[in-house]
């Protein structure tokens, strides 16, 4: 009796291992400012924290400025980007802004580049303001595959704020994919 | 033999059981527009309804303003906040607004106070125009200890839209600390 | 003694199966351009995709433009939503204009109709730029019951964004009533 | 520091018009809230017209609503108040007065404003 009983309690420890070691994977990555590009025209951003602050991943990888999955199924995925200009840094270029996010998922199976979601503004920052703020949320659920790579597009990169509570992305699991 | 199932199905009961007591927290808050600051610097909004209308709240504590965590765990936060004005409502001081939410965590233990997320936008809101609006979307995901606190910081709190689908912020736990 | 692990082997067996016919529902609805109601006023939008590209839908339904809830349970509801005008479509009708989303829930016991969530902005969209954009995005956490329907009504709906990065909406059960 | 100099004022018939200049230096005047106070002989001093800092949002006292328009220029760091349909209960000293915008409305008291002017005297007679 005791045997079957280590059975069945084993299997279910197996079970309880498995679940805890395939432990629902979440990411959530602040913008490393001290690597953004300039310009004002959309550039993949590849500089991220993944662990200081409210930086965290796990059962994930961050590799090459991007988000990479390890384990198939159903995430929801958000990012917030703040964009800021104060006079003091020098006069903008134009007025005239468009300041957007893309939220881009790759199959490196099938390499290609995908835009998950997109948010944004056409923004007038004119010269009689000293500062000029404007932010984007963006979030949604989707089925990602094992080795499916997401990464964050922006306009205006310059423009970014870099704290880590402005400028952020991220992603945990909800369920399996049946 | 039937002691030794009672004894498995027992266990796992307790198992059920407890997970049932400590079933996911979550809340919902929605702004209490009967008690809501004056003047147009940041200051932190403290009363929300959690038991009436969309607002709800459960393992977890509303109290002095403040959401309190009773579980460990991984929680995705969030926050809308929407700011509107009539001019039938007055003449406003200044047509350059900084429109800001902050969704701050304070530990009693480390008395201290972080910003988690933030969002918002300069506008320019004329006196041509009669009714101006603008909203913001904030969320992450965060982890957070029992004990910690999680309060939210505008600025501009009497151009807040008192509408409970308006004006609220949330948070639902998502998986355990490992 | 067979049998009596059988037994306890079934009985989690059925619950396992059982867990998995009653799955997390979800559901991802992308806009379905191709019928896009016209005019500035506040309308309800009864196109969406539910299973192509991005769109998809499990343990929900998708009737007659509203999205139908078929399981108890707590959900997190989010929409996203951009308007976007070109000259080259044309002049506006206006510069001032009321940019909205409404998430609603109606209730078919109690034919009534209340919103969860809105977000949106005043935009003044001058004829000396080509080009205007904007994003909206909302989303909060509710206690939805079998039979309740969520949909989704805008304010200028001939300037959606027809992409399906752009214009979504969607929901994803977190944890049962208890 | 912060300067406020009133001008404009004098003597005029009743139903008659004036129009006061208030000159500003020392600040960021396009970053400030400006009002105009008045002060008659044995009265206290009362919000008569506020305007914001882009000056699209003006507010007055209701006394003066459609005889007064406040405005400003801020080119030349200057608010106005043009006085018109003056009558003898208009006898005051005006103030010009500044402040940072505190509020997100246009603030109407005396204890809202950080900055004033001396004042300049205005007499309506009969």
């Known amino acids: 009796i005791r045997a079957e009983k280590a059975m069945v309690d084993g299997s279910w420890l197996d079970l309880a291992k498995r679940s805890k070691l395939e432990a629902q994977p979440f990411a959530h990555l602040t913008i490393n400012a001290t690597d953004i590009p300039s310009g004002s025209h959309k550039v993949s951003l590849s500089s991220w924290y993944h662990d200081r602050g409210w930086a965290k991943i796990s059962n994930m990888t961050f590799s090459n400025g991007k988000l990479i999955v390890n384990q198939d199924g159903f995430y929801y995925l958000y990012a917030n980007i703040c964009f800021r200009h104060h006079e003091t840094s020098g006069d903008l270029a134009t007025e005239y802004l468009q300041l957007m996010v893309y939220v881009t998922k790759t199959s490196i199976k099938i390499p290609s580049s995908h835009t998950l979601m997109k948010g944004g503004s056409t923004k007038y920052w004119s010269g009689n303001s000293e500062f000029h703020f404007y932010s984007i949320n963006v979030g949604g659920f989707f089925k990602l595959r094992s080795g499916e790579e997401i990464s964050i597009e922006v306009s205006n990169p310059s423009l970014l704020d870099p704290d880590q509570d402005a400028t952020y992305f991220g992603a945990f699991k909800v369920r399996d994919i049946d | 033999i039937r002691a030794e199932k009672a004894m498995v199905d027992g266990s796992w009961l307790d198992l059920a059981k407890r997970s049932k007591l400590e079933a996911q927290p979550f809340a919902h808050l929605t702004i209490n527009a009967t008690d809501i600051p004056s003047g147009s610097h940041k200051v932190s909004l403290s009363s929300w309804y959690h038991d009436r209308g969309w607002a709800k709240i459960s393992n977890m504590t509303f109290s002095n303003g403040k959401l309190i965590v009773n579980q460990d765990g991984f929680y995705y936060l969030y926050a809308n906040i929407c700011f509107r004005h009539h001019e039938t409502s007055g003449d406003l001081a200044t047509e350059y607004l900084q429109l800001m939410v902050y969704v701050t965590k304070t530990s009693i233990k480390i008395p201290s106070s972080h910003t988690l997320m933030k969002g918002g936008s300069t506008k320019y809101w004329s006196g041509n125009s009669e009714f101006h609006f603008y909203s913001i979307n904030v969320g992450g995901f965060f982890k957070l200890r029992s004990g910690e606190e999680i309060s939210i910081e505008v600025s501009n709190p009497s151009l807040l839209d008192p509408d409970q689908d308006a004006t609220y912020f949330g948070a639902f736990k998502v998986r355990d600390i490992d | 003694i067979r049998a009596e692990k059988a037994m306890v082997d079934g009985s989690w067996l059925d619950l396992a199966k059982r867990s998995k016919l009653e799955a997390q529902p979800f559901a991802h609805l992308t806009i379905n351009a191709t019928d896009i109601p016209s005019g500035s006023h506040k309308v309800s939008l009864s196109s969406w995709y539910h299973d192509r590209g991005w769109a998809k839908i499990s343990n929900m339904t998708f009737s007659n433009g509203k999205l139908i809830v078929n399981q108890d349970g707590f959900y997190y509801l989010y929409a996203n939503i951009c308007f976007r005008h070109h000259e080259t479509s044309g002049d506006l009708a206006t510069e001032y204009l009321q940019l909205m989303v409404y998430v609603t829930k109606t209730s078919i016991k109690i034919p009534s109709s209340h919103t969860l969530m809105k977000g949106g902005s005043t935009k003044y969209w001058s004829g000396n730029s080509e080009f205007h954009f904007y994003s909206i995005n909302v989303g909060g956490f509710f206690k939805l019951r079998s039979g309740e329907e969520i949909s989704i009504e805008v304010s200028n709906p001939s300037l959606l964004d027809p992409d399906q990065d752009a214009t979504y909406f969607g929901a994803f059960k977190v944890r049962d009533i208890d | 520091e912060v300067q406020l100099v009133e001008s404009g004022g004098g003597l005029v018939q009743a139903g008659g018009s004036l129009r006061l200049s208030c000159a500003a230096a020392g600040y960021t005047f396009r970053a400030y809230v400006m009002g105009w106070f008045r002060q008659a002989p044995g009265k206290e001093r009362e919000f008569v017209a506020g305007?914001?800092?882009?000056?699209?949002?003006?507010g007055y006292v209701d006394s003066v609503k459609d005889r007064f328009t406040i405005s400003r220029d801020n080119t030349k760091n200057t608010v106005y108040l043009q006085m018109a349909s003056l009558k003898p209960e208009d006898t005051a000293v005006y103030y010009c007065?500044?402040?940072?915008?505190?509020?997100?409305?246009?603030?109407?008291?005396?204890?809202?404003?950080?900055?004033w002017g001396q004042g300049t005297q205005v007499t309506v007679s009969s």
């Open positions: 007065a500044a402040t940072t915008p505190v509020t997100s409305y246009l603030p109407r008291s005396e204890r809202q404003y950080e900055h």
């Open positions: 305007i914001s800092t882009g000056g699209t949002w003006t």
